[in-house]
């Protein structure tokens, strides 16, 4: 949101670290300070881990392991508060990128699995395409166990996976995780890449 020309962004990385960044055109050459507390009755602490942009403070990283409570914060120019707010941190969740992604092939289907995150109300999304496809196809499940059927064993497919917070649970302000690395598969075997120009299918041998 904008306040006194200050744009604020909050990201709660995997329920571990909160990043609050600001973009204040009015204070572009100023080292604004960030003060915070997790309890409305406590005194504010000052940030000890600032993010810098062009030599000036532009954000703060806070350790906030598995917290679903309110972050109170004040961005100040000297002693003057430029923006003061409180936010429920969990509504700005960005899950971590999927880890230990595995592919299990069975004929024209593949099951993509990865390590489930320790908290719930997430969607695990697999996107895939072959060079024949004009856009990515997508399938998602509540756990990291996604089976995609109807694939052509002769085609090369690119896959990547990400995690999203359910909007009906966490609201509209979460962020999807970064995508996992793209992996390419053909005939149940991993490939370095899928050729941009589709290779013609091998001729079927007559019996």
């Amino acid at each position: 949101g904008a306040a006194e020309g200050v744009q604020i962004q909050i990201i709660y990385f995997n329920l571990e670290t909160v990043q609050v960044t600001w973009n204040a055109s009015k204070y572009s050459r100023t080292n604004l300070t960030f003060h915070y507390r997790f309890n409305g009755d406590e005194a504010y602490d000052q940030c000890t881990n600032y993010l810098l942009q062009e030599g000036h403070t532009s954000g703060c990283l806070l350790d906030a392991e598995q917290r679903d409570d309110i972050l109170y914060f004040s961005i100040r120019n000297g002693t003057h508060p430029v923006f003061t707010a409180s936010r429920w941190m969990v509504y700005y969740l960005k899950p971590s990128s999927p880890k230990h992604v595995r592919f299990s092939w069975h004929q024209d289907a593949v099951t993509v699995t990865c390590s489930d995150l320790s908290y719930g109300d997430l969607l695990y999304e697999v996107q895939y395409r072959s060079p024949f496809d004009t856009e990515w196809q997508s399938k998602q499940e509540n756990t990291c166990n996604v089976t995609i059927e109807g694939l052509d064993a002769e085609k090369c497919y690119s896959f990547w996976v990400r995690v999203k917070a359910m909007e009906d649970v966490y609201g509209p302000d979460t962020y999807p995780s970064d995508w996992s690395e793209v992996t390419c598969w053909q005939r149940g075997e991993i490939r370095d890449a899928c050729a941009e120009t589709p290779t013609p299918p091998k001729p079927k041998l007559s019996k």
Partner: antibody, heavy 118, light 107 residues
Amino acid sequence: EVQLLESGGGLVQPGGSLRLSCAASGFTFRSSAMHWVRQAPGKGLKWVSSVSGSGAGTYYADSVKGRFTISRDNPKNTLYLQMNSLRAEDTAVYYCVKEGGSRGFDYWGQGTLVTVSS
Amino acid sequence: DIQMTQSPSSLSASVGDRVTITCRASQDISNYLAWFQQKPGKAPKSLIYTASSLQSGVPSKFSGSGSGTDFTLTISSLQPEDFATYYCQQYNLYPPTFGQGTKVEIK
């Protein structure tokens, strides 16, 4: 469909206690912060208390701090407000409210009336 | 605490009228402002959040605007079901606080 159903209101003498309940359904209760808001007869709305999804974070208006306790039982999808040392000025309809992040106080229960009088 | 001041406190209008209610915050609240409608004997209903976003299922005759300290709620064409009390609320900074309400009555 989100539903919030308050109960436990009634007539109580000054200094007495009351426990309000709010049965929630239609959403993932354990992940949602929840609130109590009250409205004295013929008056406006006043925030009373909030609790985080896990129940670890609790917040109170100065007027009720030390007398009221907010809590939740996530397996039972129920929110509570324990009200002690009640005063005449606590007389109000008490609403249970769901937090929606930037969507604010997005769903409200129908309310339960608490009357503190001798 | 942040004070929220609504004006007017009451107004009389006719069906079909365009109605505007204003809300002023005692300090900058960005766009973390909500509007609620309350009918007699009923619970408040959320109409608008983050100053201008319509809650799901709310008709487009309701609109909100503003940022910082000054906000407005507009009902483009008042209908019989819109006669009610309207409250603004800031939720930028705890504790959340409400305006005193604006009662919209039939002229």
